[in-house]
Interface confidence: low
């Protein structure tokens, strides 16, 4: 038989979710998955999740990395599982910062 698609809505991907916005969940469904890193009060804050509306993700995902924030986006089930966003270094270090993973 042909590999026909199921009847269910095909546009969502399952994404790893990590961070305060995830509550007790460790996954979410969205039209894009993301992995982000930002610096808040000297801490490296890592987050992962999903953009449930494509336009919302399109804006954020196209933002080039800055010294204070980076977002990487992808489309595919759990595609953000092994993605860790990186801040642009350009030889510049951030003294006194610590890795701090928000769960």
């Amino acid at each position: 038989m042909e590999d026909e698609k199921p009847k269910v809505n095909p546009k969502l991907y399952m994404c790893v979710c990590e961070g305060l916005s995830c509550g007790n969940e460790d996954h979410c469904e969205g039209q894009q998955c993301f992995s982000s890193l930002s610096i808040n009060d000297g801490f490296h804050v890592y987050q992962k999740g999903c953009f449930q509306v494509y336009e919302q993700g399109k804006m954020t995902c196209k933002t080039p990395p800055s010294p204070g924030q980076a977002v990487e986006c992808c489309q595919g089930d759990w595609c953000n599982r092994n993605i860790t966003a990186q801040l642009p270094t350009k030889g510049k270090s951030f003294p006194g910062t610590q890795n701090f993973h928000l769960e």
Epitope: P6, K7, N9, M14, H27, E29, G30, Q52, V53
Partner: antibody, heavy 115, light 107 residues
């Protein structure tokens, strides 16, 4: 994350209409099919039907004549109505969001039909 | 599409390998999910697309199969795995579930 909260009358008499509502929080209402599933005490799961944000519905053929699912996108809510209930409709009713699996569920509402 | 699940109940010891099977009445490709339901709780999605584990679900749970024959395995049964397990297809409408398999610990 997507959270579903449901409510409605828990005790009905035969021939009455079952009415339940489910509110959706923290989710893209247009991204999911919104479903109702029921489970008679001690028994398995039965899919009742679904609706999307446009109001397009699909029902279980075994219940088509009695079941209506509606949506209120302004409130991010969807509702179930089941007419002419009998004791056989006694069950826990769940609202749930479906894409490729029922990943998010309401807490369940026990509906008892008894004279 | 009818989903036939077996056995309807089983009893096993902690650490045992437990396998549940689900058979579809027609080819459903890999559009099959497995759920765990504990008493008084809503079902929880464990595996989707026949073999993909939902993150956060312990790796002792696994699923295999395609077409009409599917299986679900707990590689080493733990006390917290006591529950009823259901398969469900989403190939077509109506969406249907298997009859469930209740897993108990052998004393």
């Amino acid at each position: 994350q997507v959270q579903l909260q449901q409510w409605g009358a828990g005790l009905l008499k035969p021939s009455e209409t079952l009415s339940l509502t489910c509110a959706v929080y923290n989710g893209s209402f247009s991204s999911y099919y919104w479903n109702w599933i029921r489970q008679p005490p001690g028994k398995g799961l039965e899919w009742l039907g679904e609706i999307n944000h446009r109001g397009s519905t699909n029902y279980n053929p075994s219940l088509t004549s009695r079941v209506t699912i509606s949506v209120d996108t302004s409130k991010n809510q969807f509702s179930l109505k089941l007419t002419s209930v009998t004791a056989a409709d006694t069950a826990i009713y769940y609202c749930t969001a479906h894409t490729r699996g029922f990943l998010y569920w309401g807490q369940g509402t026990l509906v008892t039909v008894s004279s | 599409i009818q989903m036939t699940q077996s056995p309807s109940s089983l009893s096993a010891s902690v650490g045992d390998r437990v396998t549940i099977t689900c058979q579809a009445s027609q080819d459903i490709n890999n559009y099959l999910n497995w759920y765990q339901q504990k008493p008084g709780k809503a079902p929880k999605l464990l595996i989707y697309d026949a073999s993909n584990l939902v993150p956060g679900v312990p790796s002792r749970f696994s699923g295999t199969g395609s077409g009409t024959d599917f299986s679900f395995t707990i590689s080493s049964l733990q006390p917290e795995d006591i529950a009823t397990y259901y398969c469900q297809h989403y190939y077509d409408l109506p969406l249907t579930f298997g009859g469930g398999t209740t897993v108990a610990i052998r004393r």
